[in-house]
Interface confidence: medium
């Protein structure tokens, strides 16, 4: 939902989560506004209060309930609105018809860890955190290794078109340290979006042997 | 804020049907709840019926329901009131109003209103 210098996003979690952004130039640093969400067939309804993120932009996270609980489904509809008070009044300010399993951004992956390392490769593995059980297998990875004297953005993706929740990393430099990051994206959802980036997982090659080629 | 122009009176015979529109510009319309108003000769302004924001909630004085109907187009930035089975006594200027404030439905402290249009049933 945007108006000109507004602009209303939200995700949800797959679970039990949206996270809403609102971004409005000229808005009122010390208005209370909260984001109110609504469901078209659901009997709960919940709200969180907007907190600045930086100078016109606010974000707040919609907790509907425990962690790995299934809140919605794909014939969901949401109306959210972002309600700012004037006074004793709530004013809309922003609205949208929330499709969730339109709007999806899974947690960042979890648990990375190094299961087998050499001079030259290296097997990690990582879990996906309140995933949906709708999405069975249908979602894909993209990972990035950060190698000494480069950046995040330089590092080539690789991707793994499949629930596949390891990787073998291959032509390492032995005895270097690198880190290692994964993101997921379920593959439905026309505004759908790759999660964060995990935590980066540190690890180092093996040194090679002494007067042998590895 | 929002201005508002309505459209589609007229005289009409009791039984009849009338539809009226309400043209807005100025504003996110999407953001607005709308209603229709009345208000006959020598009579106070009295609610009719009313659309939320995301036009998924209708409300309608005793009188009218089940022979208004309100709706929105978000897309055109229009509210409409299509009024069947017309009684002499719904005739009046009826006005069409506008309010960002989420919590006021009813009330007659709408924002913005428009200048109105007539509607005059014979019997």
């Known amino acids: 939902a945007v108006n000109g210098t507004s602009q209303f996003t939200c995700f949800y979690n797959s679970r039990a989560n949206i996270s809403c952004v609102w971004s409005q130039d000229g808005a009122l640093q010390d208005t209370s506004c909260q984001v109110h969400a609504w469901p078209d067939r659901r009997r709960w309804n919940q709200t969180c209060e907007l907190l600045p993120v930086s100078q016109a932009s606010w974000a707040c996270n919609l907790i509907l309930g425990a962690p790995d609980s299934q809140k919605l489904t794909t014939v969901d509809i949401v109306t959210l609105r972002v309600l700012c008070r004037e006074g004793v009044r709530w004013r809309v300010m922003a609205i949208q018809d929330f499709k969730p399993f339109e709007n999806l951004r899974l947690m960042a992956p979890i648990s990375l860890q190094v299961v087998h390392v050499e001079t030259h490769r290296c097997n990690i593995s990582w879990e996906i955190s309140q995933a949906s059980h709708y999405f069975e297998r249908h979602l894909e990875f993209e990972a990035r290794t950060l190698s000494p004297g480069h950046t995040w953005e330089e590092a080539p993706l690789l991707t793994l078109k499949q629930k596949q929740e390891w990787i073998c990393l291959e032509t390492l430099t032995p005895d270097t340290q690198y880190e290692f990051q994964v993101r997921v994206k379920p593959l439905q959802g026309e505004f759908t979006t790759w999660s964060p980036w995990s935590q980066p997982l540190a690890f180092r090659t093996k040194p090679a042997a002494l007067g042998k080629d590895t | 804020q929002v201005q508002l122009q309505e459209s589609g009176g007229g005289l009409v015979q009791a039984g009849g049907s009338l539809r009226l529109s309400c043209a807005a510009s100025g504003d996110v319309f999407v953001r607005y709840t709308m209603a229709w108003f009345r208000q006959a000769p020598g009579k106070e302004r009295e609610f009719v019926a009313s659309?939320?924001?995301?036009?998924?909630?209708?409300d309608y004085v005793d009188s009218v329901k089940g022979r208004f109907t309100v709706s929105r187009d978000n897309a055109k930035n229009t509210v409409y009131l299509q009024m069947n089975n017309l009684k002499p006594e719904d005739t009046a200027v009826y006005y069409c109003a506008a309010n960002t404030d989420y919590f006021q439905i009813r009330s007659l402290e709408f924002n913005t209103w428009g200048q109105g249009t007539q509607v005059t049933v014979s019997s």
């Open positions: 659309v939320t924001d995301s036009g998924r909630t209708t």
